[in-house]
């Protein structure tokens, strides 16, 4: 099965990686 989604754009867009930490570590166990 194939499905698509998208947002209108006239040219290639950059995906925003800004929602995720750049060099993540595991959550500390508490």
């Amino acid at each position: 099965s194939e499905t698509t989604t998208g947002t209108s754009s006239n040219s290639s867009q950059s995906t925003s990686n800004s929602g995720l930490a750049p060099n993540p570590t595991n959550a500390t166990t508490k």
Partner: antibody, heavy 115, light 112 residues
């Protein structure tokens, strides 16, 4: 228009394997950190894993529940990310979404693990 | 793992009225670079999720300014200043500060 096209879902028996693909267009794919997120029917969202870009050495991260069974890879020349799923369990049954670092999302592909 | 707890579980709102959703994390989401990786997503009925807000309060392109995010450390809020019919769906908070990335259980918003 940004599009993420997922394919490869279907019915598989417990213990079996399946490979999902996520083809991207309209986006600078080589810069995207690609995540896979799943959603069981009527349930919430569960992160599966992630592969980063070339400057980040294509590092991968996985949820504990799939570690050692699932493998994420990517082919920047094809603008495609992959999720290889081995040793599948009934609890892996879900709609699997690919997403560019939670920014753009595909519409999902259904994976059903059942005998 | 960081546990994300959303309240309320569901919300019935009159069109044009405000709405507020709370999200609490079991650990601080403040990352070493001074940024806080708290995202809000909306999953409309029958659709895939869509990110509305990242880094607590930054609106994604194309997201109406009636949506706003606030908070810090472990306590976050999504506010809709005036709810519209198109805002119905399930809202999720999600943390991207520490592995594994984790989501809240979701808040279902419906129209009265």
């Amino acid at each position: 228009e940004v599009q993420f096209v997922e394919s490869g879902g279907g019915l598989v028996q417990p213990g079996g394997s399946l490979k999902l693909s996520c083809a991207a267009s309209g986006v600078t794919f080589s810069e995207a950190w690609m995540d896979w997120v799943r959603q069981a029917s009527g349930k919430g969202l569960e992160w599966v894993g992630e592969i980063r870009d070339k400057p980040n050495s294509y590092v991968t991260y996985y949820a504990e529940s799939v570690k050692g069974r699932f493998t994420i890879s990517r082919d920047d020349s094809k603008n495609t990310a992959y999720l290889q799923m081995n040793s599948l369990k009934t609890e892996d049954t879900a709609v699997y979404y690919c997403t560019g670092a939670m920014d753009y999302w595909g519409q999902g592909t259904l994976v059903t693990v059942s005998s | 793992d960081i546990v994300m707890t959303q309240t309320p579980l569901s919300l019935s709102v009159t069109i044009g009225q405000p709405a507020s959703i709370s999200c609490k994390s079991s650990q601080s989401l403040l990352y070493s670079n001074g940024k806080t990786y708290l995202n809000w997503l909306l999953q409309k009925p029958g659709q895939s999720p869509k990110r509305l807000i990242y880094q607590v309060s930054k609106l994604d392109p194309g997201i109406p300014d009636r949506f706003s995010g606030s908070g810090s450390e472990t306590d976050f809020t999504l506010k809709i200043s005036r709810v519209e019919a198109e805002d119905v769906g399930i809202y999720y908070c999600m943390q991207g500060s520490s592995l594994p990335w984790t989501f809240g259980g979701g808040t279902k918003v419906e129209i009265k």
